[in-house]
């Protein structure tokens, strides 16, 4: 039971990449508005996105306070122009989201190869340490700061003339690999959190190849 012509939100979905976290839902409002509340399992409800006609709400500021907590959100529906109105039970209609634990569930964003440098038959490939919106002591933490050794990178590398992808792994942001002298190689990296069972992998970085701007070649 609810207010006349007011429908409850449905399909509440968390969309989160590198901790940038948005709650989405349906339907597009017709003569109604929404307010979102979020809390941890043990915490108080905090209201966000007051009386909005959007069907999404950016909850990043709340979840970055403790990314290892489990959060629950709920979306309240109110009649447009009469937000004090409540359902027959004395409360506005609302729908709960699924639980969301950012540390375990945020998608890993597409990594970027920062640079590569060849010295003889060795190539050092460096992955950009992406900044997140998670803060500590008023500074934004990088992905590596947040995940530590839980985060690894897989490097795919191959001769420009070949299709087979060799792999290397690191729990830092740097790889040192052996290459054949006189061959050009291409590189792509993937972020991985092996301890997860879902959302373990990021999409692959853009491919970077030797002989292009990002690299540096030194013959020793």
């Amino acid at each position: 039971s609810g207010t006349t012509n007011t429908v409850a939100a449905y399909n509440l979905t968390w969309k989160s990449t590198n901790f940038k976290t948005i709650l989405e839902w349906e339907p597009k409002p017709v003569n109604q508005v929404y307010t979102v509340q979020i809390s941890t399992k043990s915490g108080d409800w905090k209201s966000k996105c007051f009386y909005t006609t959007d069907t999404e709400c950016d909850l990043t500021d709340e979840i970055v306070k403790d990314v290892k907590q489990t959060y629950l959100a709920r979306v309240f529906s109110y009649p447009a122009g009469n937000v004090e109105s409540t359902g027959s039970a004395g409360e506005p209609l609302y729908e709960n989201s699924p639980e969301f634990t950012p540390y375990l569930e945020t998608n890993l964003g597409q990594p970027t190869i920062q640079s590569f440098e060849q010295v003889g038959t060795k190539v050092n490939v460096t992955v950009e340490d992406e900044r997140t919106l998670v803060r500590r002591n008023n500074t934004f933490l990088s992905l590596r700061d947040v995940f530590g050794k839980d985060l690894i990178y897989t490097l795919y590398y191959w001769k420009s003339s070949s299709s087979g992808k060799k792999t290397a792994k690191t729990n830092t942001n740097e790889f040192l690999i052996d290459v054949d002298k006189g061959e050009n190689y291409c590189f792509s990296v993937q972020a991985v959190i092996p301890s997860r069972t879902v959302n373990r992998k990021s999409t692959d970085s853009p491919v970077e190849c030797m002989g292009q701007e990002k690299g540096e070649f030194r013959e020793i």
């Epitope: 690894i152 897989t154 795919y156 299709s163 087979g164 992808k165 060799k166 792999t167 290397a168 792994k169 690191t170 729990n171 052996d178 993937q190 991985v192 092996p194 301890s195 997860r196 069972t197 879902v198 373990r200 992998k201 692959d204």
Partner: antibody
């Protein structure tokens, strides 16, 4: 429960083709890597190749390069080994195995294997 | 490709014996070495990962160690169910490679 089940093995003539399947359950193959490893009768383990089902990247042992192709269908949660131009020396039990993908752990779950016999 | 040279190729031992199998990598593989046990007609099973860590459910009589490029699998007190073939494997670089195997037989 994590499980890998190979199928498609059998007797094939030299020069012939065969496609092996590796059906996974208990995990999504797109989140991991799948390897094929073979074992000739009375011999040791020989790595054949791998696929990252998430992006389709593959790599093959020199002994099978150009003849074998690994693919995956994430909607079916199944990996495949297409074997062409088969030779007598390809006779083996073929295993698929899951690669956990960490620095520490590699092949943590294996299928029961399927026997491929190449003979005229 | 990195070669994994395993020795001995076979050994005979009695129940209760301490058994040691070694594997030497042809170049540095850090700790990216696993040990597998295989029984006739069965798939290999992971015993040791990262050179020295016991995989879940594996009895504590199995242990692994590393010294440079030399890796050792030790069974402290051989049990009847331990008679099998053991393989080392490096996964430091592509392609991953296996040792030739060590068959542990009953004396």
């Amino acid at each position: 429960e994590v499980q890998l089940v190979e199928s498609g093995g059998g007797l094939v003539q030299p020069g012939g083709s065969l496609r092996l399947s590796c059906a996974a359950s208990g995990f999504a193959i797109a989140n991991y890597w799948i390897h094929w490893v073979r074992q000739a009768p009375g011999k040791g383990l020989e790595w054949v190749g791998y696929i990252d089902p998430y992006n389709g990247y593959t790599y093959y042992a020199d002994s099978v390069k150009g003849r074998f192709t690994i693919s995956a269908d994430t909607s079916k949660n199944t990996a495949y080994l297409q074997m062409n131009s088969l030779r007598a020396e390809d006779t083996a039990v073929y295993y698929c195995a899951r690669d956990y993908g960490s620095l520490e752990v590699s092949l943590d779950y294996w299928g029961q294997g399927t026997l491929v016999t190449v003979s005229s | 490709d990195i070669q994994m040279t395993q020795s001995p190729s076979s050994l005979s031992a009695s129940v209760g014996d301490r058994v040691t199998i070694t594997c030497r990598a042809s170049q540095d593989v850090n700790t990216a070495v696993a040990w597998y046990q295989q029984k006739p007609g069965k798939a290999p099973k992971l015993l040791i990962y990262s050179a020295s860590f016991l995989y879940s459910g594996v009895p504590s009589r199995f242990s692994g160690s590393r010294s440079g490029t030399d890796f050792t699998l030790t069974i402290s007190s051989l049990q009847p169910e331990d008679f099998a073939t053991y393989y080392c494997q490096q996964h430091y670089t592509t392609p991953p490679t296996f040792g030739q195997g060590t068959k542990v037989e009953i004396k």
